[in-house]
């Protein structure tokens, strides 16, 4: 198991090519938002510490029909190493808080941000 | 509950245009993706485009010249329009929706009968 | 654009015994650890039905007795043991990029 964030993760975490790979959609994502990201669909928040890849993707896996997220979806999918399914959820979430998903994205990608800077990304 | 309906004009003329609607229920548009897909008799599946919930589309290559694809999210409804129509496009046309991530098509109409024909 | 060819284009298998239908990409339909390959089942008259999706994942209320293998360009469709209510024609179908496309269809019959 590898560390992320000093919490043991629950399966690899992407090495740096592949979670800046991530960084740069979410960047992406965020710069080339017109109107309201998936028509302002809301998720929910999640803890931004172990297991946290497979917690955002339980959270944006709710979301259909929003092309912007798709390569979200794969992405998050591919580093989490446990079949996720809409309407599944773990203890990772904030339940009782939901975001929109413009705003999920730019706070997965701040703490993205700051674990590439960190160098924990292997 | 999931339920798509297809109404198309049954007989169309070689050259002319095909318009089809697909009418839903149980859900909304802007959540989910339609997938147009056709059937020729006695042949296999032919996809043909989709709308997504965010209102972006893709197409199949070969017909993207002559084909569109639009929605009226409040009516519920999806519209398939199909320019200079030959024999060829003879088929059973069906509207089906998308389930979640992985976007396997997951709720059918029972399709509409298109026969062009002089 | 990714042409799915399936094989063989028709078989027919007893009852009880092993069905096995092959989907041949020609390209990988595989992207971040997945395989966006999906297998349908059509029944005469019918609109066709989700089996497998992701390659391998049984759609809810799909018999066990359905499974799907493969990855990159190479998948396969098991039906074992076939029951006389599988005969129908077989499709797989890959999202991984647009023009999504299908294969030929595999026809089964049950002797």
């Known amino acids: 198991l590898t560390c992320l964030g000093g919490f043991a993760s629950p399966g690899p975490v992407p090495p740096s090519t592949a979670l800046r790979e991530l960084i740069e959609e979410l960047v992406n994502i965020t710069q080339n938002q017109k109107a309201p990201l998936c028509n302002g669909s809301m998720v929910w928040s999640i803890n931004l510490t172990a297991g946290m890849y497979c917690a955002a993707l339980e959270s944006l896996i709710n979301v259909s029909g929003c092309s912007a997220i798709e390569k979200t979806q794969r992405m998050l999918s591919g580093f989490c190493p446990h079949k996720v399914s809409a309407g599944q959820f773990s203890s990772l979430h904030v339940r009782d808080t939901k975001i929109e998903v413009a705003q999920f994205v730019k706070d997965l990608l701040l703490h993205l941000k700051k674990l590439f800077r960190e160098g924990q990304f292997n | 509950q999931v339920q798509l309906k297809e109404s198309g004009p049954g007989l169309v003329a070689p050259s002319q245009s095909l318009s089809i609607t697909c009418t839903v229920s149980?859900?909304?548009?802007?959540?989910?993706?339609i997938n147009w897909v056709r059937q020729p008799p006695g042949k296999g599946l032919e996809w043909l485009g989709l709308i997504w919930g965010d209102g972006n589309t893709a197409f199949n290559s070969a017909l993207k010249s002559r084909l569109s694809i639009s929605k009226d999210n409040s009516k519920s409804q999806v519209f398939l329009k199909l320019n200079s129509l030959q024999t060829d496009d003879t088929a059973r046309y069906y509207c089906?929706?998308?389930?979640?991530?992985?976007?396997?098509?997951?709720?059918w109409g029972q399709g509409t009968s298109v026969t062009v024909s002089s | 654009n990714i042409v799915l060819t399936q094989s063989p284009a028709s078989l027919a298998v007893s009852l009880g015994q092993r069905a096995t239908i092959s989907c041949r990409a020609s390209e990988t339909v595989d992207s971040y650890g997945n395989s966006f390959m999906h297998w349908y089942q059509q029944k005469p008259g019918q609109p066709p039905k989700l089996l497998i999706y992701?390659?391998?994942n049984l759609e809810s209320g799909v018999p066990a007795r359905f499974s799907g293998s493969g990855s990159r360009t190479d998948f396969t469709l098991t039906i074992d043991p076939v029951e006389a209510d599988d005969a129908a024609t077989y499709y797989c179908q890959q999202n991984n990029e647009d023009p999504r496309t299908f294969g030929g269809g595999t026809k089964l019959e049950i002797k």
């Open positions: 992701l390659a391998s």
């Open positions: 149980g859900f909304s548009l802007t959540g989910y993706n």
């Open positions: 089906a929706r998308d389930g979640y991530y992985p976007y396997a098509i997951k709720y």
